[in-house]
């Protein structure tokens, strides 16, 4: 499955939207900094089957979508930018869905390293718990916004490697 070129553009637009969403300086939130233990190894792997890599990318985008579509999120961010973010993420999910399904049916269900999916899920659990503990404060959201940008940057690298494999 070839990820359409629009997927890369969508990824870039998502990064730009996340950057535009910034409401306060991260420097004013230094006391709220947190290590979410991003599962970098799940994004470095050249050992990945293509289907698995696509599933991991899908999980990141799906969890990001869920994170930013909560009631607490709609209070924290500019609604116009949030709507644009939803549109971009939704389009990327559609692109990846088609690819996952294609990879599944090409050779039967490929063996998926379920631990990769779990690692991503746990990462977003840590983010969710952090927001809960910080009572969804503006600084907490700012820290999370910056963290999501970081995770998207890493997933972009994985996408590029996927494209080179095609």
């Amino acid at each position: 499955c070839d990820l359409p070129q629009t997927h890369s553009l969508g990824h870039r637009r998502t990064m730009m939207l996340l950057a535009q969403m910034r409401r306060i300086s991260l420097f004013s939130c230094l006391k709220d900094r947190h290590d979410f233990r991003f599962p970098q190894e799940e994004f470095d792997g050249n050992q990945f089957q293509k289907a698995e890599a696509i599933s991991v990318l899908h999980e990141v985008i799906q969890q990001t979508f869920n994170l930013f579509s909560t009631k607490d999120s709609s209070v924290a961010w500019d609604e116009r930018l949030l709507d644009k973010l939803y549109t971009e993420l939704y389009q990327q999910l559609n692109d990846l869905e088609a690819c996952v399904m294609q990879e599944v049916w090409v050779g039967g269900t490929p063996l998926m390293n379920e631990d990769s999916i779990l690692a991503v899920r746990k990462y977003f659990q840590r983010i969710t718990l952090y927001l809960t503990e910080k009572k969804y404060s503006p600084c907490a959201w700012e820290v999370v916004r910056a963290e999501i940008m970081r995770s998207f940057s890493s997933s972009r690298n994985l996408q590029e490697r996927l494209r080179r494999k095609e």
């Epitope: 269900t109 631990d115 779990l118 746990k122 659990q125 809960t132």
Partner: antibody, heavy 119, light 108 residues
Framework: QVQLVQSGAEVKKPGASVKVSCKAS????????MHWVRQAPGQGLEWMGE????????IYAQKFQGRVTMTRDTSTSTVYMELSSLRSEDTAVYYC????????????WGQGTLVTVSS | EIVLTQSPATLSLSPGERATLSCSAG???????LYWYQQKPGQAPRLLIY???NLASGIPARFSGSGSGTDFTLTISSLEPEDFAVYYC?????????FGQGTKLEIK
Amino acid sequence: QVQLVQSGAEVKKPGASVKVSCKASGYTFTNYWMHWVRQAPGQGLEWMGEINPSHGRTIYAQKFQGRVTMTRDTSTSTVYMELSSLRSEDTAVYYCARGGLGPAWFAYWGQGTLVTVSS
Amino acid sequence: EIVLTQSPATLSLSPGERATLSCSAGSSVDSSYLYWYQQKPGQAPRLLIYSTSNLASGIPARFSGSGSGTDFTLTISSLEPEDFAVYYCHQWSSYPFTFGQGTKLEIK
């Protein structure tokens, strides 16, 4: 509000298959993994596996690998759990439970479907 | 597979008393992924506590959770008649996800 509605009770003979459905409403169906958990009479809870309704990928507990098949129909927001080669030990209440994160993990359950395996 | 062992199997107490339920894991479980559920006869389980110590929505403050590593505890500070049920601990720290065998809390 989130609702998970399961199909009715089933009686099956050993060796047969059963297919239980779970219809979701009140949220975006494709955004959350759906899990299946079973409970034999008077026993504890046992996780069987999960499906991502968005693309249909599944993760099964080793114990059920080869006997369980989880599928979904996005047009009706329904997930299915099929268990084959039934034996008497498969007599149980089967629940679907929605995944999520933090306070949303297994916060929503179906009402349960009793499957009785008897000759 | 992480085996969760709950004790005691049955706990007989009176309303107003304090209940302490234990959950012991066969190997270490990150506290973020340890949950507690309550189940009454004929009903589906109900989420009580998430990530070891956080109260789920609508759960009374008499319920609390604690622990880390391999030992976790659910405490009910003063039992109400509606608290008599079966309680399960659950982990999703690693596949396959598992539940304890349950502790039945019954009226003395």
